[in-house]
Interface confidence: medium
Amino acid sequence: KEEQTTFRDCAEIFKSGLTTSGIYTLTFPNSTEEIKAYCDMDVGGGGWTVIQHREDGSVDFQRTWKEYKEGFGSPLGEYWLGNEFVSQLTGQHRYVLKIQLKDWEGNEAHSLYDHFYLAGEESNYRIHLTGLTGTAGKISSISQPGSDFSTKDSDNDKCICKCSQMLSGGWWFDACGPSNLNGQYYPQKQNTNKFNGIKWYYWKGSGYSLKATTMMIRPADF
């Protein structure tokens, strides 16, 4: 049997025997195009492809549509993997989405969706989610049914306002909705009463900006 040399996600890498968390090269489905991603091989059995991470405010998340499409930042730190890759990947296979959150008081919580995919760019990378479980709220902080993705230069939200400009960052804004993990990063003691911060309403309420977030995906049949 030939050894697999290209991997479409971190689950394939894990199954190949590479079980150390770190940066790996993934290949777009049905293509030779490559992308670097952080693979979490430790959390909940490993095999997680990290698609977003915030931890210290070192990366500016108020980016353009093109940047969110292609990805930005460093997989070793804060980054966005890229809507196009995630859309193609999740359109091929059933994926789960795990969102890990940390507040400034040392608490951690998570939300797990048992089916996650992004529509294509022609549908503004609209998010589709079902089957919420976890400790970060019984109600989904990503509005259901899912919204289109919006950025500062591509306003696709359901508001007469421009959510991305007001709340900062690209996100699946509703009008403007109960979450934004790509909002402005606020340090400790400056993280409350901030409507444009890193928000997950059904865990921390209105105006609380989180310390760290990670969004990661894995095949449902892993």
Epitope: S143, C159, I160, C161, M166, G177, P178, N193, K199, S206
Partner: antibody, heavy 123, light 112 residues
């Protein structure tokens, strides 16, 4: 498209109650706050209160506290405003309006308004 | 409660000419997040109010760029660079900083 459709005009006697409905369509009802604003003839707009359509939390203007009750039926995507102990000065057009907010009810604008419901209080 | 005061009460305008409406609040509307919680609405004859400007200076989607909101803290202005016939109606400012949300008394804009 996104719209709010309110119930029809009402004529009530002093001391009675009125319940106005506001049916939302074209968006996820439970993701927003719904506010109620009234306008008496020749008067300025007057905010009455709001409901978080997701969890049902309400907040009322002190002026109407004890007389107004705002509720919602998520299965029907409809918000209701009931005003009791009606008096002649409650004669007004009553509007529902969707709140754009930081989530949690701190609405910083009303982006969609219902067409208004005329309530006349007369003996 | 925060009291909102608008002037003038009535504003006769000539199409193509500029117009300006003032709104004052009894206390600062500048939030700690840097935004002024002041909105402008237009109520055209026989219609519901419609949002023009939110958070002091942000034009709502679909609002022509001839409308501009400015000001900070307690003094705000809505400017129409060139009035058109469709701009007639009553303009209201509203403070959204704290409940009860309160509106100005309105400014009636009419064509001369």
């Amino acid at each position: 498209q996104v719209q709010l459709v309110q119930s029809g005009a009402e004529v009530k006697k002093p001391g009675a109650s009125v319940k106005v409905s506001c049916k939302a369509s074209g968006y996820t009802f439970t993701s927003y706050a719904m506010h109620w604003v009234r306008q008496a003839p020749g008067q300025r707009l007057e905010w009455m209160g709001w409901i978080n359509a997701g969890n049902g939390n309400t907040k009322y203007s002190q002026k109407f506290q004890g007389r107004v009750t705002i509720t919602r039926d998520t299965s029907a995507s409809t918000a209701y405003m009931e005003l009791s102990g009606l008096r002649s000065e409650d004669t007004a057009v009553y509007y529902c309006a969707r709140g754009v907010d930081d989530y949690g009810g701190n609405s910083w604008a009303f982006d969609i308004w219902g067409q208004g419901t005329m309530v006349t209080v007369s003996s | 409660d925060i009291v909102m005061t608008q002037s003038p009460l009535s504003l006769p305008v000539t199409p193509g000419e500029p117009a300006s409406i003032s709104c004052r609040s009894s206390q600062s509307l500048l939030h700690s997040n840097g935004y002024n919680y002041l909105d402008w609405y237009l109520q055209k004859p026989g219609q519901s109010p419609q949002l023009l400007i939110y958070l002091g200076s942000n034009r709502a989607s679909g609002v022509p760029d001839r409308f501009t909101g400015s000001g900070s803290a307690t003094d705000f202005t809505l400017r129409i660079s060139r009035v058109e016939a469709e701009d007639v109606g009553v303009y209201y400012c509203m403070q959204a900083l704290q409940t009860p949300l309160t509106f100005g008394g309105g400014t009636k804009v009419e064509i001369k």
